[in-house]
């Protein structure tokens, strides 16, 4: 089965929907090979029979109306379906359900009853039909301004449910962007791999990175990003001066703005690149970024020397996609296995380095840097979310702190670098930052505020600072670091934590923790999340189980211990309609939560109260 296709299964009858003809939609023993049983979403609310390239619909919104197949019409109210609670499936905006088995009727009918015979799943899963939801495919080039492919579409009186090369000599795959190409003549190429599709991209000969300039399209920022992602790419990020110069040349003949990946869509943080590249190079148009609310997305202006301007994300523009090795210098971020034996007194170890906050004696940035270097280190450079979360959660960082780190643009204006010379691989700006205020003299960077995010600051301001040095193998672990915890467990706040040593299913991991007189970890707030991210994020394993799942009640996530879910840290598109158990990711998306099948094997984190901690009283109900 193509990933978009599925069989519509009723668990009670143990049968699947079978389209025998356009006027007869019945059920049969499930057979994943049978074309007549394959269906797929072709819009947010329409389901198409793969065999007939026609859509499921009804003649009227009435009880006991027959469900049959019709020419797909995105405007028809009689072809709009929706998933309701608990695998119920029916016509949109009604309480009439897709039903089989009542009154000895062989055909699928609309029925007002919401019993087991009106409940449908994707065959072979526990998921409702909407879990295989429609994903719009944005066309490229052509004459339709990047519009979405309309499946099925008619060409030379034949219906196509997929991209086709029909009518072309070059084999390029295309789609109609209305249901009737013969009438409307609107088309675009499909964002798929086919012979010659590399011609859709421009390759920078210096870096090998590929760029796609979609100047004829007119999409919102989010649509543009979806289009790039469909091609295993992302909206453009610019981290190097050379890259900006290459793009200036590439776009010089164009006049209209093009979406790039820069945005301030995260409420808690500042400017960031979609895809996670560090925001370290600034190329704003004079007067930008505008502080007007809602202008959270950024376009590159070819006519204005390819400088950047922030706009409302719903504007429709062309866009630039980027794929291939990132422009970041090759740099090995230490993994957790490189953790040293320890650090000098008052310094804290993490992944091969030692860290210390100095807040007693405030210094201007230059003198703070000198002080760190005198101790054998440098102002702290931060290369990953894990390292950031370690500093934030384990160094004694305080919400009212404002501390120098090593990032600055002293050498080249608008191009931030670390004072220790390591490459910039990560940034975490506060909202509205970097602002380059005070006559553009904010050349140094501080970590500040309750989240420890960053802001640029005038370097002459006396502040506390964070030093970092390479660890010395003979040094000692800070005293009392894991007080109240058994050997091998790590202390944070009132709790002890252990990383499970074996790959286990969710159930087995839960048993292991119980045997250790602990439980699969809960996450109560962002401080605990930051600690856990720093604990597991750099490890080579892909996932670590937490105690969260919706196995007891699909759609309602609960911890294995009866604690309220008060904090979440979902990855993009999670939990969606997925059912299962929740694990923390490592790597680029370090610490973010994904829903996995509970039978998958992953490492895990156990948690229990530390010895000597006075527990709060149990809440009374």
């Amino acid at each position: 089965l193509d990933a978009r296709q599925f069989l519509i299964y009723n668990e009670d009858h143990k049968r699947c929907v079978d389209a025998l003809s356009a006027i007869s939609v019945q059920t049969a023993t499930c057979n994943p090979e049978a074309e007549s049983q394959k269906f797929r979403w072709v819009s947010d609310s329409q389901i198409m029979s793969v065999a007939f390239k026609l859509c499921l619909g009804v003649p009227s919104k009435t009880d006991w109306a027959s469900v049959t197949l019709y020419a797909c019409d995105s405007k028809s109210e009689y072809q709009k379906w929706e998933c309701k609670n608990d695998t119920l499936f029916g016509i949109k905006g009604t309480e009439l359900y897709f039903n089989y088995g009542n009154r000895q009727e062989k055909n699928i009918k609309l029925y007002k009853g919401s019993g087991l015979w009106s409940r449908w799943k994707v065959y072979g899963t526990t998921d409702d039909l909407c879990s295989r939801g429609y994903e719009a495919m944005y066309s490229l080039l052509g004459n339709a301004n990047g519009a979405v492919c309309a499946f099925p579409f008619k060409f030379e009186n034949k219906w196509y449910a997929d991209c086709t090369s029909a009518g072309r000599s070059d084999g390029w795959l295309w789609c109609g962007t209305t249901t009737d190409y013969d009438k409307d003549k609107l088309f675009g190429f499909c964002p798929l791999h086919f012979e010659g599709s590399e011609r859709l991209w421009n390759k920078d000969p210096l870096t090998g990175i590929l760029y796609q300039i979609n100047s004829k399209s007119a999409l919102t920022w989010h649509q543009a990003r979806a289009s790039c992602k469909q091609q295993n790419a992302d909206l453009l990020s610019v981290t190097e001066i050379h890259e900006q110069m290459y793009l200036t040349g590439l776009t010089s003949s164009l006049s209209s703005g093009l979406w790039i990946g820069l945005n301030s869509l995260s409420v808690r943080s500042g400017w960031q690149w979609a895809g996670g590249s560090p925001f370290r190079y600034l190329n704003w148009l004079p007067g930008s970024p505008s502080s007007e609310p809602g202008k959270s997305c950024v376009s590159l202006n070819p006519g204005k020397n390819a400088k950047w301007e922030n706009l409302e994300c719903v504007q429709k523009l062309g866009y630039i996609c980027k794929k291939g090795n990132n422009t970041l210098n090759p740099f090995i971020i230490p993994s957790a296995s490189d953790v040293p034996t320890g650090c000098p007194n008052q310094w804290w170890p993490y992944a091969g380095h030692c860290y210390r906050i100095h807040r007693e004696e405030k210094k201007i940035q230059k003198y703070a840097l000198q002080a760190c270097r005198k101790e054998g280190g440098d102002l702290a450079s931060i290369h990953s979310i894990e390292e950031f979360d370690f500093i934030f959660s384990q160094l004694g960082y305080e919400p009212n702190d404002e501390l120098w780190i090593g990032l600055n643009d002293i050498k080249i204006q608008m191009y931030f670098e670390w004072s220790d010379g390591t490459p910039v691989t990560f940034t975490k700006w506060l909202p509205g930052e970097p602002s380059h205020e005070n006559n553009r003299q904010e050349d140094c960077v501080v970590m500040k505020g309750k989240d420890g995010y960053w802001a640029d600051r005038a370097c002459e301001q006396p502040l506390g600072y964070i030093c970092k040095m390479v660890s010395q193998s003979h040094a000692v672990v800070p005293e009392g670091a894991d007080k109240g915890c058994r050997k091998g467990w790590k202390r944070h706040g009132f709790y002890c934590y252990l990383i499970g040593s074996t790959l286990s299913t969710f159930t087995d991991a839960n048993h292991t923790c119980t045997n250790e007189k602990a439980y699969l970890t809960t996450v109560e707030d962002r401080y605990e999340q930051a600690f856990l991210t720093s604990l597991v994020g750099l490890r080579p394993e892909k996932y670590f189980w937490t105690g969260l799942s919706d196995v007891q009640n699909k759609g309602t996530f609960r911890w294995t211990v009866d604690e309220q879910v008060q904090f979440t840290h979902w990855n993009a598109d999670m939990p969606g309609r997925k059912a299962g158990c929740v694990a923390m990711k490592t790597g680029v998306a370090g610490g973010l939560w994904d829903v996995l099948s509970c039978e998958e094997k992953a490492k895990f984190v156990c948690k229990h109260w530390a010895e000597g901690v006075t527990r709060p009283p149990e809440p009374t109900t």
Partner: nanobody
Framework: QVQLQESGGGLVQPGGSLRLSCAAS????????IGWYRQAPGKQRELVAT???????NYADSVKGRFSISRDNAKNTVYLQMNSLKPEDTAVYYC?????????????WGQGTQVTVSS
């Protein structure tokens, strides 16, 4: 824009040969592939042969082993060598170019050249 000019058509006896030429001009760098199509009276236009930018070729089953498509990059010309011609090959032969900037699915067409196979 791409302009296409066909030549080389004519009257030939069954079993004979002809070589058609298609000269391309204009924005030739945008061309992905050039194909030959034909249309006999009262019939649908059908694909005969194609050659892509990378040099891969493709033929209709009815002409495999008899027709051969080739190109001369220096002259921006594509050729269709037609051997062992049959009366059913009689048609107007059209040259077609597909580019990545096509504003309709079919791309660009030449005016066509008539090929008649008759004794």
């Amino acid at each position: 824009q791409v302009q296409l000019q066909e030549s080389g058509g004519g009257l030939v006896q069954p079993g004979g040969s002809l070589r058609l030429s298609c000269a391309a001009s204009g924005n030739i760098f945008s061309i992905n592939a050039i194909g030959w199509y034909r249309q006999a009276p009262g019939k649908q236009r059908e694909l005969v042969a194609t050659i892509t930018l990378s040099g891969s070729t493709n033929y209709a089953d009815s002409v495999k082993g008899r027709f051969s498509i080739s190109r001369d990059n220096a002259k921006n010309t594509v050729y269709l060598q037609m051997n062992s011609l049959k009366p059913e090959d009689t048609a107007v032969y059209y040259c077609n170019a597909n580019t990545y900037s096509d504003s309709d699915v079919y791309g660009y067409w030449g005016q066509g050249t008539q090929v008649t196979v008759s004794s």
